[in-house]
Amino acid sequence: LQDPCSNCPAGTFCDNNRNQICSPCPPNSFSSAGGQRTCDICRQCKGVFRTRKECSSTSNAECDCTPGFHCLGAGCSMCEQDCKQGQELTKKGCKDCCFGTFNDQKRGICRPWTNCSLDGKSVLVNGTKERDVVCGPSPADLSPGASSVTPPAPAREPGHSPQ
């Protein structure tokens, strides 16, 4: 025998107490599949959350975060305060990155500058709180006569053909 509840479409629930008739989900609730015996209460995007997608009778609301905050967790289950580049969020709020570390985003932690010498390279551009160092060629590559870079060809004077 087929379960009579299987005929109830998404957006309804199968009412056990009413001879298993299909009743519509009340406002602010939904059922995303057919044959359900309950409706799920819609998520409410309140406070620091804002509504990205309204709840319907067949799908839940989706939230994101108000400006100045960003989502964390599955389905934006939390909002975390943004910081500026060059900062990280601590229990006491946004703090500048310590010397030798950087953060190029509004979220996340300060990370150590790349240690160019570990790759046998030199520092081409110094790091800042907002940017990592830029590593250049190894010091050996910079010694006279060791350059593998082809020098630029001399500019030709106009009106002369090559010899």
Epitope: F13, P27, N28, S29, R37, T38, D40, K46
Partner: nanobody, 120 residues
Framework: EVQLLESGGGLVQPGGSLRLSCAAS????????VGWFRQAPGKEREYVGT??????HYGDFENNRFTISRDNSKNTVYLQMNSLRAEDTAVYYC???????????????QGQGTLVTVSS
């Protein structure tokens, strides 16, 4: 931690009325359906009804004698019980869930209950 506190139970004569209250601390009812269950001595727990977003759903025993309502300003849900009978004697529990109705659901939180005795 969410705590649900039922009140309003007591001794009432057959045919009389009682209004039970369920107050929430630690969280508002905003995001939850609120349900009532009852358990008579030596019997299985029985579903009374669920309230959500202006809609109420009731168990199949109550024959329009029970009404669930809500006062948002007081963060309280009520169960109005009229034309009470001896068989309505039970401990009445308030519960909350993210499901509506709660007839087939294990609630997320449930109170300690309030005893209603219908007797002459």
């Amino acid at each position: 931690e969410v705590q649900l506190l039922e009140s309003g139970g007591g001794l009432v004569q057959p045919g009389g009325s009682l209004r039970l209250s369920c107050a929430a601390s630690g969280r508002t009812f905003d995001n939850y359906a609120v349900g009532w269950f009852r358990q008579a001595p030596g019997k299985e727990r029985e579903y009374v009804g669920t309230y959500w977003s202006g809609y109420a759903h009731y168990g199949d025993f109550e024959n329009n004698r029970f009404t669930i309502s809500r006062d948002n300003s007081k963060n309280t849900v009520y169960l109005q019980m009229n034309s009470l009978r001896a068989e309505d004697t039970a401990v009445y529990y308030c519960a909350i869930s993210l499901k509506y109705p709660m007839a087939t659901v294990t609630p997320d939180y449930q109170g300690q209950g309030t005893l209603v005795t219908v007797s002459s």
